[in-house]
């Protein structure tokens, strides 16, 4: 689904956050300065990511503040590395029928997940919610990101003189308008109706439509309800 990708959509303004979402909570994938990867209930400077599309649906995910690439070892553990290894630091991106995104290692086949278990990706599978991601536009002021992005430390490294070659730290004009949020709701649970148990809407946080051609009305992706 190359055209349904957050990588190509112009609405995300350079920096995005990948997050898992259940009916009640969400965790944002963050890459810490020491390379540790985990989830946070909110956007943090370490969950601000740059996702670059490569050939055949492959992506490279970068933690802007940690200046580390998201990588995976042979056991399926994800970690942040200053060095780009094409075998470990490229992921296959796929959009599931439910509109959520999964990322898996073409080398080791494991899914990127915020859960501790390591599961291989199989076509047609329904991964657990902590292995399915949505994307949100960055809401943290750009002044907090006054740091160079990582460069590939390989033989074909990019020009060291360019601190921000992709202009991810500079706001970009959007080529096409995108709705601020989607109004589609997930089916309400019979015993936990979102309207009944969440009258103030604290779990129905709006999210940016970062994927063109989504599954819901007006191209909206799944509407995640979380606090």
């Amino acid at each position: 689904y190359p055209n349904a990708s957050p990588l190509l959509g112009s609405s995300w303004g350079g920096l995005i956050h990948l997050y898992t979402a259940t009916a009640r909570n969400s965790y944002h994938l963050q890459i810490h300065k020491n390379g540790h990867v985990d989830g946070a209930p909110h956007q943090t400077i370490y969950s601000a990511l740059m996702i670059r599309s490569e050939d055949a649906g492959f992506v490279v995910i970068t933690g802007v503040m940690s200046r580390r690439y998201l990588c995976m070892d042979f056991r399926g553990n994800i970690f942040g590395s200053h060095y780009f290894d094409p075998e470990n630091c490229r992921f296959q991106h796929q959009t599931l029928e439910n509109g959520y995104d999964v990322y898996h290692s073409p080398q080791y086949h494991f899914l990127v997940s915020l859960g501790r278990a390591k599961r291989a990706f199989l076509p047609g599978m329904n991964p657990p919610p902590y292995s399915q991601f949505l994307s949100r536009r960055n809401e943290i002021p750009l002044i907090h990101f006054n740091t160079p992005i990582p460069r590939r430390h390989t033989r074909s490294a990019e020009d060291d003189s360019e601190r921000d070659p992709l202009n991810v730290l500079k706001p970009r004009a959007r080529m096409t308008p995108a709705p601020a949020s989607c109004s589609q709701e997930l089916p309400s649970a019979e015993d936990n109706s979102p309207m009944a148990s969440d009258p103030l809407g604290v779990v129905r946080g709006g999210r940016v439509n970062t994927h063109a051609g989504g599954t819901g009305p007006e191209g909206c992706r799944p509407f995640a309800k979380f606090i």
């Epitope: 259940t22 989830g39 946070a40 902590y130």
Partner: antibody, heavy 117, light 106 residues
Framework: QVQLVQSGAEVKKPGASVKVSCKAS????????MHWVRQAPGQGLEWMGI????????SNAQKFQGRVTMTRDTSTSTVYMELSSLRSEDTAVYYC??????????WGQGTMVTVSS | AIQLTQSPSSLSASVGDRVTITCRAS??????LVWYQQKPGKAPKLLIY???SLESGVPSRFSGSGSGTDFTLTISSLQPEDFATYYC????????FGPGTKVDIK
């Protein structure tokens, strides 16, 4: 090491309110949601609600809507659960539990709340 | 909401027995299932997460399996300290618990 320490047992009269605290230590408080679960005597576990430690936003099971209030104090890494309009069937042990994305990995020791006239 | 049912609701077994507890979800929950052990007067203890992953520090005689709607917790050789109540919990949408299975001494 991670610890969740809850306040002591309470005895309340029907119609009153009770506020139970849960003090977290040994981890970054704002990095994990916190849940409240209760267990009536001889019964199973019942999920009550969840609180986002950074924003304070909450979401409750429909059964408790309007009666339960969850709050947090980030300065002391403490979450609170207040249950109002108590009735005898609210007699239970109340637990706080830390969310680890894929499980509740740490639990408080529990707080017994007895509602009796 | 997704409902969880456990069977049996209670069972009597002897030390050394192989014990199997099942948990069924009312709809598919992938592998987002957790098992806890609870002893009287104590808080629940995490045993298995993601349906089949053993939590650190939990003895290897405990194992979990299943995906979708049907899940199993197995204790390969019951030990004296394993007499307790076991709960499943789904993590797919809300945080529903199963009703529990009490394992007592035959």
């Amino acid at each position: 090491q991670v610890q969740l320490v809850q306040s002591g047992a309470e005895v309340k009269k029907p119609g009153a309110s009770v506020k139970v605290s849960c003090k977290a230590s040994g981890y970054t408080f704002t990095n994990h949601y916190m849940h409240w679960v209760r267990q009536a005597p001889g019964q199973g576990l019942e999920w009550m609600g969840i609180i986002n430690p950074i924003s304070g936003s909450t979401s409750n099971a429909q059964k408790f809507q309007g009666r339960v209030t969850m709050t947090r104090d980030t300065s002391t890494s403490t979450v609170y659960m207040e249950l109002s309009s108590l009735r005898s069937e609210d007699t239970a042990v109340y637990y706080c539990a830390r969310d680890r994305v894929d499980a509740f990995d740490f639990w408080g020791q529990g707080t017994m709340v007895t509602v009796s006239s | 909401a997704i409902q969880l049912t456990q069977s049996p609701s209670s069972l009597s077994a002897s030390v050394g027995d192989r014990v199997t507890i099942t948990c069924r979800a009312s709809q598919g929950i992938s592998s987002a299932l957790v098992w806890y052990q609870q002893k009287p007067g104590k808080a629940p203890k995490l045993l298995i997460y993601d349906a089949s992953s053993l939590e650190s520090g939990v003895p290897s005689r405990f194992s979990g399996s299943g995906s979708g709607t049907d899940f199993t917790l197995t204790i390969s050789s019951l030990q004296p300290e394993d007499f307790a109540t076991y709960y499943c919990q789904q993590f797919n949408d809300y945080f529903t618990f199963g009703p529990g299975t009490k394992v007592d001494i035959k």
